[in-house]
Each structure stands twice: as structure tokens, then as C-alpha cells.
Amino acid sequence: WKFMGSKCSNSGIECDSSGTCINPSNWCDGVSHCPGGEDENRCVRLYGPNFILQVYSSQRKSWHPVCQDDWNENYGRAACRDMGYKNNFYSSQGIVDDSGSTSFMKLNTSAGNVDIYKKLYHSDACSSKAVVSLRCIACGVNLNSSRQSRIVGGESALPGAWPWQVSLHVQNVHVCGGSIITPEWIVTAAHCVEKPLNNPWHWTAFAGILRQSFMFYGAGYQVEKVISHPNYDSKTKNNDIALMKLQKPLTFNDLVKPVCLPNPGMMLQPEQLCWISGWGATEEKGKTSEVLNAAKVLLIETQRCNSRYVYDNLITPAMICAGFLQGNVDSCQGDSGGPLVTSKNNIWWLIGDTSWGSGCAKAYRPGVYGNVMVFTDWIYRQMRADG
């Protein structure tokens, strides 16, 4: 969650609805200062790969973990709801060693039947020595890890290996990939839904099916809403992310499952191992693949990707590069919008959405992906706004 609004000074926080700036001490203080009330509904986040629940303290103007003392499932559900997840998505809550935290938010159980955040107070002690970890949705679990393969020139993925992968069709033709993040929401790329494809009735999503020939009218899910990032730039492909809301929720099973959105505090390493998947062309200027393919790629530091011999400063903070500078393995046309994922703590995280590249699998021209970490705040806001 980024509270440094672009229009506000370093100490100010921007209201989404009006663009006005408010003081951080007014954020999450129990009183609405933004016209849309968003200063009071963005007060909770999950932090790091262990999903540690953190609440914003208006007194301290910073985030703090929630002490396990007196905490229960109902509070957990409320916190997930405030992030934008529906009650029926709720997965579980756990307890994590406080790992040296010195500052906590604690429940005041005598506060009566009031809003959860009004029950929380700042404390330097936590008697249980444990903080709340929250899973708002059972995400990031797959069946098989795919064998080594490539999207350009490679082999097929195994069933259940990438259960969050969807194929997005227009007029019965695969156009883009996407990633399931809840039963109703798909992450894809904004460039996939540029005009004239910005109207939702053109789109159908297919989940849990590996072969394009098995995707036919009736097996797909109609799209009800298409939300493109408001700051998407079609020329530079900056902020290349979009959401699709499905008309009916997906039914999760071994072949259809959500991927986890990354949490703040998750550090990506240069050369971190990731995977890409999709039905894109298996060679440059080739046709869409009949089968789902997947490939191992490595993250490439932005500084390196922005060097003169690679993309020469075209990479923004809202982008991530992945692949190999020697080429050979890459996403290609038709993979757009699909996932770039990485595994941490045995959980698969959506790090990027396939965005652009110069050709496919060329040396010094790696794949460029939307940096999902930068967009999680925006994603949760859309989910919340939709109720």
C-alpha cells in the first residue's frame, strides 16, 4: 500500500476520489476525511511472505503487526473484508512468532461492539509473543510443478501446474492470458483490453483447460466488468494492468485455483527464479499454441534492463524484466496478460503480468512484465469498490 500520493508532499496522503491531500495523522483515525471515505478503509494490509496482518496507526503514522492476544476468526474475516475479499473466500488465520517486533496493535476487548479499528490501540508489549497471520483466500497452491519447457519453442504444461492461468477469448479466439486472484477476479494486461476490446461483453474466460480445442461456447465464463488501470499509457505500456470481473464465480478445484497477490515487504532478488505460462506463439510471428506452455525465467535487475544495450531506459518502476539476456526463452504474442510467478515459502506469487518485448526470445531483448507489486493497492481498491 503506497501512501505517498503523487500530488501530495512527502508527508501527505492523497484521496483517490478527489485528489485532495490529507495529513497522515488523519488516516485511519475513525473519521472520514476523504469524500469517498477511503482514508478509513485502507487501514489494513498483509505483510511479507507470511501474511502478517498489519494495521496503520494514525498516532505513529506507520504500520504495525496485530498482537494475537484476544484475536479471533471474526476479526480476521473483517480485516479480509476490508481489504476487498469476500467473506466466503476466507481461508485461515495463523500465528507467527513476533520476530522481534517492538510495536504492536492490540485489541481492547472492553471497547464494546464497535468497528474493529476502534478496538485496536497501540502497545509496546504483546503477552502472547505472537502476531496474527491472515490468509484471506487459499491461494498459490498448485498440483504439479511443470517440467522445464518454453513458451517459445517448448513443451506443454502439466495439468494443475498453473491452475490460476486463464485463456481470454474474443469471438471464440484466444486473445490474451490472465491470472485468477479470487473466484470472481482475473488480472490481465491493460493492452489486452484497449479499444475496441474494452467492453466486457466481448470477453469469455476459460479456466482449468489446457488445450484451446477444448474451449468452446458454454464452457467459458462471461466477463461482467473490465477495469483498465487509469494511468495506463498505450505508447510506453506503463501501468499495463487490468482487471476482469466474471459474471459468475469460478468453482475452485485441482485445476482451477487462485495465485497469491504479492504482499508489501516481499523482496525480489535479481536472478530470482520465476515461471511464465501461456498459449502464445511458440516462435516469433507464429500462431497461438494449441496447448498451454510454461517456462523458467530469471528476473533481470531494472538497472541492467534499462542499460543502453537492452531497453535503454524504457523500463519504469511499474515494469519488471524477466528472461535470459542470451535469448531462447521468452513469452510471445498471445501470452500477454498471463502470469509471471515465483515460489516463496511453498506459495506461488503473481509477480508480473506479461506486457511487452522487442520480438520474442531475442538476445538482449527479455520479456517485460507489469510489476504487480506496484498495483496491489489499486487491485484491492477495485475489489473493495465492487463490494
Epitope: 474474443v170 469471438q171 479466439v173 475496441p196 467492453n199 466486457p200 461483453w201 461456447y217 461482467e224 459474471q247
Partner: antibody, heavy 118, light 109 residues
Framework: EVQLQQSGPELVKPGASVKISCKAS????????MNWVKRRHGKSLEWIGN????????SYNQKFKGKATLTVDKSSSTAYMELRSLTSEDSVVYYC???????????WGQGTLVTVSA | QAVVTQESALTTSPGETVTLTCRSS?????????ANWVQEKPDHLFTGLIG???NRAPGVPARFSGSLIGDKAALTITGAQTEDEAIYFC?????????FGGGTKLTVL
Amino acid sequence: EVQLQQSGPELVKPGASVKISCKASGYTFTDYYMNWVKRRHGKSLEWIGNINPNNGGTSYNQKFKGKATLTVDKSSSTAYMELRSLTSEDSVVYYCAREGDLFPFAYWGQGTLVTVSA
Amino acid sequence: QAVVTQESALTTSPGETVTLTCRSSIGTVTTSNFANWVQEKPDHLFTGLIGASNNRAPGVPARFSGSLIGDKAALTITGAQTEDEAIYFCALWFSNHWVFGGGTKLTVL
């Protein structure tokens, strides 16, 4: 200002074909799907199909598959509908209608009357 | 194929509020039917009014509003004017095709 200018009335013989046009102006032609609609005598409307002017991709109402063929010419910003094997049932007014954002039928042409007569 | 039903005719007076409805033969009209309303003036000129249930087209007066009421889509004209006399068609999306209603002839007396 968005304008859709359709071709003039057509008198054709039964069994023949006709191609009617819809010239678009006042917007970027490839930015919006074009729909075609049949106006029955009296007042009902029937959706024939639509076309993506960007790539020529089409969707048809099952009822009009084999009857109507939709095409575009990007260079002249014109959408076309060809109707074949015409019968008296096809003697009606046909409209092109451009999509808008969240609007399938935002802007309409003035209509083209096709009369099928021996 | 689904059938979309509208009132065949309605009469209202200037300044009154009138509601036109649009029903689907295969169940409740939902946001996923992207209900939209088109106006046909007597000179056979068509104009898109409302898209995706409740979005007013640019330039359409605020007295026109769209909604979903019960199991139907509705077009409400709050404070009808004589120039609103027209035929109003609704169209609903059914997975891969649009279906129009028969149209409602609105008379403003």
C-alpha cells in the same frame, strides 16, 4: 461529430445478393465495433452481428449465419454488409450502429432500405 | 433464443415520471445482460440512451436513468417532456448475441 452514412436504397431480384455500406467519420474507425441491425416492418429490431474493424473479427446471430457477411475497409473507414440469397423476408431497413464505451448501439446510421422484388 | 418483452405502449403527461421495463424470458435481468436502451424518434433516427444497465450516454439529459428493478431492466424518465415522445427499445446480451425487445411507444400528451 460521429457520423455513420449508409448507402442508398436497393431494389434487387429474389435469389440475388446486395452489399450495403456504412461510412464512418468523426472518430477513429478502428476504435469501436460496428453492429448491424435489421428493422422489421412494424417496429421490432434484430441484431445481425458485429465486426471488429481492427482485425475483421466477426460475431453473428445464429439466424443470420450464411445470410449476412460483414467486412470492413480500414482505408476508407467503411463497414459493409453483404446479404445473399435474398427473399421477400429480407425486404426491410438495415442499420449500422457503432459501439461506445459500455454502449453496444451508441450511434446509428440513417438506415438502408432493401426491396426484394421480381 | 431468449425473448425480450416490453410494454407495447405507455402514455404520460409532461412533467410526470414514467418507467418502461424490459423482461427476459429466461429469468432475471442482471448486470451481465448489459441492458441498454435506444430511442427512435418519429423520423427513424435512433440514439443510444443508456448502456450497461445504468450508464447514460454523453449528451443524454439527466431525466433519463436506467436501473434493474426486481427481475427486469427499467428506463425511468423523470419529468417527461413532449420531445420524449418516441419508441424506446431495450436490448439484452445473452452470452454471445444481443436480443432486442419489441419496443415501447411512449406518448407524451
